[in-house]
């Protein structure tokens, strides 16, 4: 297409556009208002002058070059008309090839445009969304902290208010122990003095209790050897009266036996006429060391040799390997008679042994055995009992076979752990085993649910603490 | 002083289930062990399932093992028997006890009856339908 046109710019400046098929033709024509023309009118190439030139004429030489312009417009249009004519098959073609070349270099950069564009915008897209997943995270991450953060505080603020609570406490404890404290020094003193007193009293009764025990034997003893000689005199008198009224007797003398002064047990000192119940001395057998030991004369026919006593819990009985090997405590009230003398003595002859036991609610029992003795040192006075019968349980409480003896510094038993220790006195423990007759002492009320009191489980079952308890052995043929 | 309290029997049909629990005062579960028993009546008392260590050693009686689960709380001071699979035959007295747990025969992995020392006052477990 083709077309033409006439215009005025911003400047005021006239401008010709020739507009044909895709290209446009722009001519800007110079001023004339402020131009002369020299001699000629068609002459333009002249000299600019100074001084103006009236208005009438430079509107007439304007007319006359508009005239000549679209004259050469014209012509112009003509030979571009007589050029597309000519050159419109060859263009075309020209046209045509370029068009094809160039669209299809055009479709292959388009294409790899449009890949590489899909490419960056699938990362893109891909980014993104780990941007917003990184961002989403982070948010979370962000409340939760911020969450945490205000619960801390809070924490922070509550435990400061606690310490300082604690701290104004711990000022006014503080200042409470101090005060008890002097309080507590005066009262120590003031007990200090009271148990230096009581010392002094307590060694003084110690003193005057041992000497009393010593008269209490020797009277025990010369009460005896009186009854013994009361009993020797009354039948010496019998058979003096019953010779006196015989006619036919002749005077003779009366020969006695030569009086025993020693006794390995209570059943020789029964024998020998002594039958009242209390502290005699026995001598060891094949030997002169003495023993001090209470002989029941009234239990079951008499003549029984206590070797343990238990009723009050007056006497500790969380004692070493020698005070059980040599005895301890006193024969008047809690004792343990020694291993070793009862090792000998029951090493001779055949014993039976009598276990007593009462409980706190006013009832006794007992178990009796047959035969009962006891191993040497050299075997930790192993126990060895047989023939069980009584009222204190249809099975020994007394582990059977026999155990070795154990106290807190010699451990013998069968537990992996030291029984002594744990329950508390020598025994013949098991592991720990159903009976620990040296235990702690308990109290009325206080004696149930005990790990370590005075136990014979096969009658009152385990963890009850027993009120009294007393062994005693007398030779089996007595 | 020791003390055993039981809780947690009842009545319970054939089949069913109870959990029994031991709380325990005076006394550490670290340093002892725990033992259920059982008394039918006209029967004598039976072990039934016993603990040690915080639950790291367990021992059953044949009667009651795959049915009956021991287990501990040292922090509640408190020992449980879990119960399944009821009989008639469970029906008993049941008592919790404690023994300090070092008290063992040499070879041996749990104690005696008579070992037990401190007893509860016992829970009646009824079965019947």
């Known amino acids: 297409y083709s077309n033409f046109r006439k215009s005025v710019d911003s400047t005021g400046r006239r401008q010709y556009q020739v507009q044909n098929g895709p290209c446009s033709y722009t001519f800007l024509l110079p001023e004339t208002d402020s131009c002369r023309s020299s001699s000629s009118p068609y002459m333009s190439n002249a000299v600019q002058r100074d001084a103006p030139l009236d208005y009438d004429d430079s509107v007439q030489r304007l007319q006359v070059l508009e005239n000549i312009l679209e004259n050469n417009t014209q012509w112009l249009m003509k030979l571009e008309n007589y050029i597309q004519d000519n050159m419109k098959k060859e263009m075309v073609e020209i046209q045509q090839n370029v068009v094809q070349n160039q669209t299809a270099v055009m479709i292959e950069i388009g294409t790899s445009l449009l890949n590489q564009t899909a490419a960056q915008t699938r990362k893109l897209t891909d980014v993104e969304a780990q941007v917003l997943n990184q961002t989403t995270r982070l948010e979370l991450q962000l409340l939760q902290h911020s969450i945490s953060t205000n619960k801390l505080e809070k924490q922070i603020l509550d435990q400061t208010s606690e310490i300082n609570k604690l701290q104004n406490k711990n000022s006014f404890l503080e200042q409470k122990v101090l005060d008890m404290e002097g309080k507590h020094s005066e009262q120590l003193q003031s007990m200090k003095e009271q148990k230096d007193e009581l010392q002094v009293l307590v060694s003084k009764q110690s003193s005057v209790i041992d000497e009393l025990e010593k008269k209490l034997v020797t009277a025990t003893v010369n009460n005896s050897l009186l009854q013994k000689q009361q009993h020797d005199l009354m039948e010496t008198v019998n058979s003096l009266l019953t010779m006196m009224s015989s006619p036919n007797s002749k005077s003779s003398v009366a020969i006695r036996k030569e009086e025993q002064t020693t006794f390995r047990d209570c059943a020789e000192i029964f024998k020998s006429g002594l039958t009242t119940s209390g502290i005699y001395t026995l001598t060891f057998p094949n030997s002169t060391e003495e023993i001090k030991a209470y002989c029941d004369m009234d239990v079951g026919g008499g003549g029984w040799t206590v070797i343990q006593h238990r009723e009050d819990g007056s006497v500790d009985f969380q004692r070493t390997w020698k005070e059980y090997k040599e005895g301890f405590g006193s024969p008047l009230g809690e004792y343990w008679l020694g291993n070793e003398f009862v090792s000998q003595l029951t090493g001779q002859h055949r014993y039976v042994l009598k276990i007593q036991l009462k409980d706190w609610e006013g009832n006794e029992a007992h178990s009796l055995y047959d035969h009962f003795y006891l191993a040497g040192e050299e075997s930790n006075y192993r126990i060895h009992l047989t023939g069980l019968t009584g009222t204190a349980g249809k099975i020994s409480s007394i582990s059977q076979p026999g155990s070795d003896f154990s106290t807190k510094d010699s451990d013998n038993d069968k537990c992996i752990c030291k029984c002594s220790q744990m329950l508390s006195g020598g025994w013949w423990f098991d592991a720990c085993g159903p009976s620990n007759l040296n235990g702690q002492y308990y109290p009325q009320k206080q004696n149930t649910n005990k790990f370590n009191g005075i136990k014979w489980y096969y009658w009152k079952g385990s963890g009850y603490s027993l009120k009294a308890t007393t062994m005693m052995i007398r030779p089996a043929d007595f | 002083e020791v003390q055993l309290v039981e809780s947690g029997g009842g009545l319970v049909q054939p089949g069913g289930s109870l959990r029994l629990s031991c709380a325990v005062s005076?006394?550490?579960?670290?340093?002892?062990?725990i033992g259920w028993f059982r008394q039918a009546p006209g029967k004598e008392r039976e072990g039934v399932s016993a603990?040690?260590?915080?639950?790291?050693?367990?021992y059953y009686a044949d009667s009651v093992k795959g049915r009956f689960t021991i287990s501990s709380d040292n922090s509640k001071n408190t020992v449980y028997l879990q119960m399944n699979s009821l009989r008639p035959e469970d029906t008993a007295v049941y008592y919790c006890?404690?023994?300090?747990?070092?008290?063992?025969?040499?070879?041996?992995?749990?104690?005696?009856?008579?070992?037990?020392?401190?007893w509860g006052q016992g829970t009646l477990v009824t079965v019947s339908s």
């Open positions: 006890a404690a023994v300090p747990a070092g008290r063992l025969r040499y070879g041996e992995q749990w104690y005696p009856i008579y070992e037990y020392d401190a």
């Open positions: 005076g006394i550490t579960l670290d340093d002892y062990a």
């Open positions: 603990i040690r260590e915080s639950g790291g050693s367990t």
